[in-house]
């Protein structure tokens, strides 16, 4: 992982939605009983920020032990700290749980940088600000780790919400969400609204702030504006999707669309950045530089290393372009686009300059493992992981940060031919040596 971009190794304030609210549109899909409407008890159940991850409160064991757990759609293990660690305020104490069952099996998960390892077991798990159910789930009790937990992040474990195919040690270890759906009447769907603050939050502000919502089993109307647009889940391992076109300020990058998905494109709440394949990243940065050419920024800024500071309140958002990703639609030859603002891809960084400054890191970076639509993308949108119908929905988030001139957008339909050709078919040999790291 480079510069803490993949979380945990890869590297809003107040109760109201952050940023300016947008007017509601009325052209919504028909109601589906039990899956849409109001989920008041789950709204605002996430805290955190893009740089360190968004977490939900969970309880494990009997009597229940409360832990904060990172919500990660880019992995499939439920793993919690189970031994003292300098960065953990608390950890899962299996010996105190009367319902813990040891699976007598170890698990080792190496990342590009860092790792965690632990012991597998099962226990009773619930989500206080989630559905009113308790499930017996697989738990990896982390006994040793390196560069996994983040100092000051306030989470003690990770909830991998992707599919069994990428679970460790193998796909026989049932992920938490599969267990939840099997053991309860919760519909096979969840949705995420990640709310970037648009300004840096210190430790106490993060603890007091709302970071967003994870709606388990449904869709909450209050969390988005306009319509939901769906893209097929190409394959159930990661949440893999297909990007068919990329534009910077409306200018097509004009690359073979296979490049956008080389070797895959995934939606990953556990990654901070929008990560792009090398060729795509280089073309995108060139285009972003050209669009903002009245200014010159240091080379290290475009590498996500140096940060650029402006006097508080004077960040020239207007010189930075919008970025549009066109996703395969549900209908043949139809696509839709999601558009993010610099307010999403310039990530506020705290504790570096004076309080008179607003400082940012460039949150688009290079990838050798395909496109990763991380938190900076997800912070613009309400994202529905409709596992039941093998699709992912996007709508403009009610809490996304924007200005008076531009807003994030989800628009369609657009006619796009031969979209199936945009998908990259990973050779069988590569899949068997799947890289866990998201650097």
């Amino acid at each position: 992982t480079q510069h803490g971009i993949r979380l945990p190794l890869r590297s809003g304030l107040g109760g109201a939605p952050l940023g300016l609210r947008l007017p509601r549109e009325t052209d919504e899909e028909p109601e589906e009983p039990g899956r849409r409407g109001s989920f008041v008890e789950m709204v605002d159940n996430l805290r955190g920020k893009s740089g360190q991850g968004y977490y939900v409160e969970m309880t494990v064991g009997s009597p229940p032990q409360t832990l904060n757990i990172l919500v990660d759609t880019g992995s499939s293990n439920f793993a919690v700290g189970a031994a003292p660690h300098p960065f953990l305020h608390r950890y899962y104490q299996r010996q105190l749980s009367s319902t813990y069952r040891d699976l007598r099996k170890g698990v080792y998960v190496p990342y590009t940088q860092g790792k965690w390892e632990g012991e597998l077991g099962t226990d009773l798990v619930s989500i206080p600000h989630g559905p009113n159910v308790t499930v017996r789930a697989n738990i990896a009790a982390i006994t040793e780790s390196d560069k996994f937990f983040i100092n000051g992040s306030n989470w003690e474990g990770i909830l991998g919400l992707a599919y069994a195919e990428i679970a460790r040690p193998d796909d026989s270890l049932e992920p938490f969400f599969d267990s939840l759906v099997k053991q309860t009447h919760v519909p096979n769907l969840f949705s995420l609204q990640l709310c970037g603050a648009g300004f840096p939050l210190n430790q106490s502000e993060v603890l007091a702030s709302v970071g967003g919502s994870m709606i388990i089993g449904g869709i909450d109307h209050s969390l988005y504006t306009g319509s939901l647009w769906y893209t097929p889940i190409r394959r159930e391992w990661y949440y893999e999707v297909i990007i068919v076109r990329v534009e910077i300020n409306g200018q097509d990058l004009k690359m073979d669309c296979k490049e956008y998905n080389y070797d895959k494109s995934i939606v990953d709440s556990g990654t901070t950045n929008l990560r792009l394949p090398k060729k795509v990243f280089e073309a995108a940065v060139k285009s972003i530089k050209a669009a903002s050419s009245t200014e010159k920024f240091p080379d290290g800024f475009w590498l996500g290393e140096q940060l650029v500071c402006w006097q508080a309140g004077t960040t020239p958002w207007n010189i930075f372009p919008v970025i549009s990703l066109y996703l395969m639609g549900e209908v043949t030859n139809q696509s839709f686009r999601i558009t993010i603002l610099p307010q999403q891809y310039l990530r506020p960084v705290e504790d570096v300059a004076t309080s008179q400054d607003d400082c940012y890191k460039f949150a688009i970076s290079q990838s050798s493992t395909g496109t990763v639509m991380g938190a900076v993308i997800m912070e613009g949108f309400y994202v529905v992981f409709d596992r039941a119908r093998k699709r992912i929905g996007f709508a403009v988030s009610a809490c996304h940060v924007h200005d008076e001139f531009r807003t994030a957008a989800v628009e369609g339909p657009f006619v796009t031919l031969d979209m199936e050709d945009c998908g990259y078919n990973i050779p069988q040999t590569d899949e068997s040596t799947l890289m866990t790291g998201r650097a």
């Epitope: 200014e295 920024f297 290290g300 290393e305 140096q306 650029v308 500071c309 570096v352």
Partner: antibody, heavy 120, light 108 residues
Amino acid sequence: QLQLQESGPGLVKPSETLSLTCTVSGGSISRGSYYWGWIRQPPGKGLEWIGMIYYSGSTWYNPSLKSRVTISVDTSKNQFSLKLSSVTAADTAVYYCARVGHGVSYFDLWGRGTLVTVSS
Amino acid sequence: EIVLTQSPATLSLSPGERATLSCRASQSVSSYLAWYQQKPGQAPRLLIYDASNRATGIPARFSGSGSGTDFTLTISSLEPEDFAVYYCQQAYVWPPRTFGGGTKVEIK
């Protein structure tokens, strides 16, 4: 070989405006790889960054001086200039112009400097 | 604001000796740090950039190391012309406006 040379009055009265010009020779100021900056050094003290400018006219200033500083560029003359208003004795210093290179992060080429004294 | 603290303030050495100058940042500046040399009556000159890269024309006896918060400028064997004041400067937070207070290397 690129050279920078500061010019301007060596004595300025308190409350007046200090004006300096940096002439770049041996290369074009319009080359997009660089910013052009001003740094000052009070007698016997350390270096203080004043601000910098890109050939497009985009400027960045030290917040502590921002209300009094204006940096401008004249690409036709291959020059950039500094104006510092409402000067006091605390503004007495050697003023250097410099090129900001190496990924526009470091001052890789400097003028010889000019001493400006603020006194009545 | 990132503060750069240089130590020692003065270093008294003889020609031929090894000089080790320190620059400590109040928080991490990654490897975005430069060293400058300033002789009396002259402008500063860039010696090292990005913590360890020698600028054009700088002799090999000058070397830089470190990352994060602790940086070192080493002059392996002092020549008479090396007695000067040395400044560090960070560029992690940009624009690059922070210099250290300087270390004077004087003849013992």
